[in-house]
């Protein structure tokens, strides 16, 4: 997360850290007991290595008594994910048991009216993805509240030029922005999660290149048939 | 302690801009939104928009677009607002108010400034 | 965009008593509201945020309730303090609008 701040400990307690070898490698959103939502480019970077979700985390070093260590049993990517495009960049992740849940772990709701969320409208975006330009990594959970972009101006060719599909939505980046490590978290509008980040090569906290984020209103039934 | 502090009434002509202003104090200036809002003597409240003062974005409600131009000056912790070409409906109290941030993304106006009155008169 | 309708528009009341304002938004709102209290001449104040979470320093006798299109502010036991305007205004979405107010007088 570039240009936010420091997320209160254990305020979201949806958030997930999807881990390949122990190594955080993107975000994730507990959406159910047994399953975390992430981006199907996720696990184009996990290789050959055994993903793990990490559930009720704020610091990913220190212990805490909240945080949890899943294996996972089944990986399911949206179908029709592509490597070459962030279009249905979406990813189930089927933890080996029900997660224990408490104050620290706990599903968030999910958006299933398929309309677009209004412009201007502030999202927080919140994951342990880098923090610099440099490529600073951060050790506990970062956050930010940004508007909703409308999809016209993220469309326009200085932007985004006509990339974005309704399935996606835009978040302003002028600044403050998910970025590399973020793929796959929430953005949460007021209590319920409406879209996932995508896991492009976009360049972050450029206001010429919004945040793109799968809506998962549009992916409604494929999510229901999944978790079935 | 939190404080927004407006500057002081002002009597202007029609068809003439007035600039108010609204300095904080007590937090991080640049980490919260801060929003303006009208309200015409004896009615409710009107949203005009937001700025975040760490980036200088705007949002304006679009029944505001053109009347209102929001700004930051991030070195005096002060927003501006600068209201243009004023009829005399645009006679008001017009404050300026903090987004609090509660649990994930909740948000709501949790500190306001005292309010700025705007007469708009021949 | 939203529309906030708030009721009633006045309310007389007496001291002690208990009352009810509600706020009917023209959608789901998805209990991202907030309710504030003006008196004459004062700024707002934040009473309740996310529908049912009091601001700091907010006595216990207010509470907020509801979900999905319909909510309410509740006052118990009135306090002469408690006289004045009472606003909703609703955060799911752009512009965030306010409900039409809800004036507050001592019978």
């Known amino acids: 997360i570039l240009g936010g701040r420091e997320a209160e400990a254990h305020a979201r307690p949806y958030m997930a850290s999807v881990q390949v070898n122990g190594e955080h490698l993107c975000g994730g959103v507990l959406v159910a007991e047994q399953w975390v939502l992430s981006a199907a480019h996720c696990l184009e970077d996990a290789a050959d290595g055994k993903v793990q979700v990490l559930l009720g985390a704020h610091s990913l070093s220190q212990p805490e008594p909240s945080k949890r260590l899943y294996d996972v049993l089944r990986a399911v990517p949206h179908p029709d994910s592509r490597p070459d495009t962030i279009d249905h960049d979406l990813l189930l992740l089927q933890l080996s048991e029900k997660a224990t849940l408490g104050p620290a772990v706990r599903p968030l709701p999910w958006q299933r009216v398929d309309r677009d969320v209004e412009p201007g409208t502030l999202c927080d975006v919140a994951g342990w993805g880098i923090v610099s330009h440099a490529g600073r990594r951060p050790d506990r959970l970062q956050h930010v509240l940004l508007p909703v972009l409308d999809r016209a101006t993220c469309n326009r060719r200085t932007h985004h030029d006509g990339a974005i599909t309704q399935r996606m939505m835009c978040a302003e980046s002028n600044r403050r922005d998910s970025c590399k490590g973020d793929s796959g978290g929430p953005l949460v509008c007021g209590g319920v999660l409406e879209g996932v980040v995508t896991s492009g090569s976009r360049v972050c906290g450029n206001r010429k290149k919004p945040g793109i984020y799968t809506r998962v209103a549009s992916y409604a039934a494929w999510i229901d048939s999944v978790l079935a | 302690q939190v404080q927004l502090q407006q500057s002081g009434p002002e009597l202007v002509k029609p068809g003439a801009s007035v600039k108010i202003s609204c300095k904080a104090s007590g937090y991080t200036f640049t980490d919260y939104y801060i929003n303006w809002v009208k309200q015409r003597p004896g009615q409710g409240l009107e949203w005009i928009g937001w700025i975040f003062p760490g980036s200088g974005s705007t949002y304006y409600n679009e029944k505001f677009k053109g009347k209102a131009t929001l700004t930051v000056d991030k070195s005096s912790s002060t927003a501006y607002m600068l209201l243009s070409s004023l009829p005399s409906e645009d006679s008001a109290v017009y404050f300026c108010?903090?987004?609090?941030?509660?649990?994930?993304?909740?948000?709501?106006?949790?500190?306001w400034g005292q309010g700025t009155s705007v007469t708009v008169s021949s | 965009d939203i529309q906030m309708t708030q009721s009633p528009a006045s309310l007389s009341v007496s001291v002690g008593e208990t009352v009810t304002i509600t706020c009917r938004a023209s959608?789901?709102?998805?209990?991202?509201l907030a309710w504030y209290q003006q008196k004459q001449g004062k700024s707002p104040q934040l009473l309740v945020y996310?529908?049912?979470n009091l601001a700091d320093g907010v006595p216990s006798r207010f509470s907020g309730s509801g979900s999905g299109t319909q909510y309410s502010l509740k006052i118990n036991s009135l306090q002469s303090e408690d006289f004045g305007s009472y606003y909703c205004q609703h955060f799911w979405g752009s512009p965030p609008t306010f409900g039409g107010g809800t004036k507050l007088e001592i019978k």
């Open positions: 108010a903090r987004y609090g941030y509660y649990g994930s993304s909740f948000y709501a106006m949790d500190y």
């Open positions: 996310a529908a049912t």
């Open positions: 959608e789901n709102i998805y209990s991202n």
